[in-house]
């Protein structure tokens, strides 16, 4: 019988008392085979973290800073359940740390030196740790003691709770630096008042502070937010302009064998019986003998944290950067206006080899990081382990939902002004063998399908989106008799046709021979009835253009396209017979790396792009013999995006809507995780 006990860690007598009450009340409402609570008392949150890591306890609720401690080795804990605030219809699990300024003040984030600052309090998250952590490497040396460095950075501050004797400049704007509401500039509202009164130039608070203090929109319009990319935005655009997105209060557990499903089952049942306005005799979110015991008194309920989400992703790149800077106190020696090497994310060992060769030829401007799937690469870019990669539009969508931005687009047509003219896109097509003359778009049910990969544009999002509109369900593996759609569940019929050996079967990388455009076409040639690819795939792999044994004798005339009106056309008539127009592949990165990735990639394509004529004796960035490694092989150049610099603008309204409709069919664990952070 599996042990269904969750050992909750309590950090005080009062918490232990509430825990015992929690345990007893849960016993009274949950059947004996359901989850139960046991209580473990420790002296501090750090002791609780260690106890969970050592399997002496299972769960505890922590503030963001402690979630970071819990994640660090050797603890390796992960977030499993989040408290939410506000309503069930619009649950808030995060708040945003922001930098508020007056509208007419005219400086940016990178011009804060010498300004006057208002903080909620020394050592507090939004008011100190996050802004000072992010500014850490701009502080004058020596950076220890930190208070002295901050005092020398700003021309005057109010940082309640600071030592006014040792660091008088930190108390210059609020004499005495009182650590309570007796100091008019203490806390969120106090820091905002410090800005409003004109004492300070910038206030570090949370996004809701300005709304709580100024009910009138006209008054709020006198203020703006400083963004990390050195722009400003209106105060209601905090989701796109903040210093960090911070989880409020989170239950953590072990990463391996952490009982996360059991903890959720317990807390979900607990909120049903003892949540807000549920029971008089015991209330989860109330602390008669103290404040915020076990859970925050202001919480309204719990939400399950998606399993794909580790602590780094949950806390977010900015927050982790800020806290790491404060804790480790290390800064790069290079001047910050110089670009560091771009860490390119390579999928599996084939791309890694090409990336390594690029790295050698770039003389260190490019470094390489490996991952097994595109989603793993996107996650690495999110958390700073990697910086950039080129993605199919379907993954540009996921990357965008995860906060990444497109920076350059692949162009596939030769033109005089390639780098300045991003193209409208390529065509997603359905290819069949000419010999299968009875096959049309309308009778694909029961046929064998070949896809580039799950989540990709031409191979999945476009054809499956169209199919979904027809069949109104997501069971595509029942619609086709079998197929190869790399990235599907291994036991799915959509992995049956795949050719990868062992663990590589149906993997969404080049270890699976039927992965990608060329792979999907090969799948059609060897086993399938229909392949969903791009309009250039057939000509690129026929007429001897692909020397691989399976392709070298293929003839373009032996294949036809399926049109949406039920007819068929020759391959070259793709402009009048396609499923949809697809946005070109694009390079994505984090917002903070956008300028450097843009600069370095433009240099790299001038050195190794399509201007290189002899690829047998020189490194060619856009060549890998039909394998589309790192970039599509038909890339002519990487083009500027001009104003199409967000994923929505880049992909276009129509495609974003189409992928949004397919979301209900999504198996993307990363998309689920990122949507949790930003619904």
């Amino acid at each position: 019988v599996p042990d269904k006990t969750v050992r909750w860690c309590a950090v005080s007598e009062h918490e232990a008392t509430k825990c015992q009450s929690f345990r007893d009340h849960m016993k009274s409402v949950i059947p004996s085979d359901g989850p139960s609570v046991a209580c473990v008392k420790k002296a501090s949150y750090l002791d609780c973290i260690r106890a969970i890591a050592a399997n002496e306890a299972d769960a505890v609720t922590l503030d963001a800073g402690l979630v970071y401690d819990a994640y660090l080795a050797p603890n390796n804990l992960k977030p499993v359940v989040a408290e939410f605030y506000g309503s069930k219809e619009d649950p808030q699990t995060f708040y945003y740390a922001v930098a508020v300024v007056k509208k007419d003040s005219g400086f940016q984030m990178n011009q804060l030196r010498g300004k006057k600052s208002c903080h909620t309090g020394l050592g507090r998250s939004a008011g100190w740790n996050i802004p000072i952590g992010l500014l850490y490497c701009d502080l004058p040396e020596p950076r220890k003691p930190l208070e002295k460095a901050v005092a020398n950075f700003f021309s005057g501050s109010c940082a309640p709770c600071a030592d006014g004797t040792d660091f008088p400049q930190l108390c210059q704007l609020c004499p005495g630096c009182g650590c309570s509401t007796l100091n008019q500039y203490f806390g969120y509202s106090g820091a905002f008042k410090c800005l409003k009164d004109g004492a300070g130039d910038v206030a570090f608070v949370k996004h809701s502070t300005i709304f709580e203090n100024l009910a009138n929109k006209a008054d709020r319009d006198q203020y703006e937010l400083l963004c990390l990319d050195n722009t400003r935005k209106p105060v209601d655009e905090y989701k796109d302009c903040h210093l960090a997105q911070v989880p409020s209060h989170t239950v953590v557990a072990r990463s391996m064998g952490g009982k996360e499903d059991l903890i959720w089952e317990l807390l979900n049942q607990a909120q049903e019986h003892f949540g807000k306005d549920k029971s008089k005799e015991f209330q989860l979110f109330s602390s008669p003998h103290g404040k915020d015991l076990l859970f925050k008194d202001s919480a309204h309920g719990f939400l399950k944290v998606p399993p794909r989400m580790d602590a780094k992703m949950y806390l977010g790149y900015e927050y982790v950067t800020a806290i790491r800077n404060l804790r480790e106190g290390t800064c790069p020696e290079a001047p910050t206006d110089e670009c560091k090497p771009v860490k390119w994310c390579a999928l599996s060992h084939h791309e890694r080899l090409k990336c390594d060769e690029w790295s050698v030829n770039s003389v260190g401007k490019i470094e390489c990081v490996s991952a097994e799937t595109t989603e793993d690469c996107i996650a690495k870019i999110m958390n700073g382990e990697a910086d950039a990669m080129s993605l199919d539009g379907g993954f540009v969508y996921i990357a965008g939902k995860c906060g990444l931005v497109p920076v350059l687009a692949e162009n596939y047509n030769k033109s005089d002004n390639c780098e300045d003219t991003p193209e409208a896109g390529y065509f997603a097509i359905a290819v069949v063998k000419k010999s299968a003359s009875d096959l049309t778009w309308d009778n694909l049910k029961g046929k064998k399908s070949c896809h580039t990969a799950v989540g990709r544009t031409a191979g999945w999002n476009i054809p499956m989106g169209l199919l979904y509109n027809k069949i109104n369900h997501c069971r595509f593996d029942e619609f086709f008799s079998e197929g190869c759609a790399p990235g599907s569940k291994k036991d799915s019929s959509l992995c049956k046709l795949c050719m990868g050996s062992g663990l590589n079967l149906c993997e969404p990388n080049n270890k699976e021979g039927y992965y990608g455009y060329t792979g999907a076409f090969r799948c059609l040639v060897e086993k399938g009835d229909v392949a969903f690819v791009k309009h250039q795939t057939v000509p690129q792999n026929t007429g001897g253009k692909n020397p691989d044994p399976w392709a070298k004798n293929l003839n373009e005339k032996d294949y036809e396209l399926l049109c949406l009106d039920g007819t068929r056309k020759p391959v070259e008539e793709y402009a009048n017979c396609h499923l949809a127009r697809a946005p070109n592949h694009a390079v994505v990165t984090r917002k903070d790396k956008e300028a450097c990735v843009h600069k370095i990639l433009r240099q790299q394509q001038h050195l190794f792009g399509s201007n290189v004529t002899d690829c047998s004796g020189n490194f060619c960035l856009f060549r890998s013999e039909t394998k589309d490694l790192l970039f599509r092989d038909d890339t002519v150049c990487l083009a500027k995006l001009h104003d199409r610099n967000t994923y929505e603008k880049y992909l276009g309204e129509e495609y974003v809507k189409a992928v949004g409709n397919l979301r209900k069919c999504s198996t993307s664990s990363l998309l689920e995780a990122c949507t949790f952070r930003r619904p």
Epitope: H350, E351, D356, V360, N361, G617, F619, R623, S624
Partner: nanobody, 117 residues
Amino acid sequence: QVQLVESGGGLVQAGGSLRLSCVASGSIASIATMAWYRQAPGQQRELVAGITRGGSTHYADSVKGRFTISRDNAKNTLYLQMNSLEPEDTAVYYCTDYSRRYYEDYWGQGTQVTVSS
């Protein structure tokens, strides 16, 4: 395709030196990029050092200042001079010429380097 044969490995004390050679069966003069990789037991194969046809070099952070890569096109040979060896350098060392077909996993037998403390 050019065949590559590595040699020069062996057992050496920490702080010692070794020079690895990689002889090609054909001309390397027109080969764009050549490199040394290494693979320790249970680890992924990793890039150690690379050199372009024009002589530009690139090194993994862990070997910078200790290892030197060079090529002699007349002798069709790639070299890796390894100084101040550390136990962490223990691995099988391979050379590659990055043929255009990155996806064809052609590797020689490599040469074992063991650094004892």
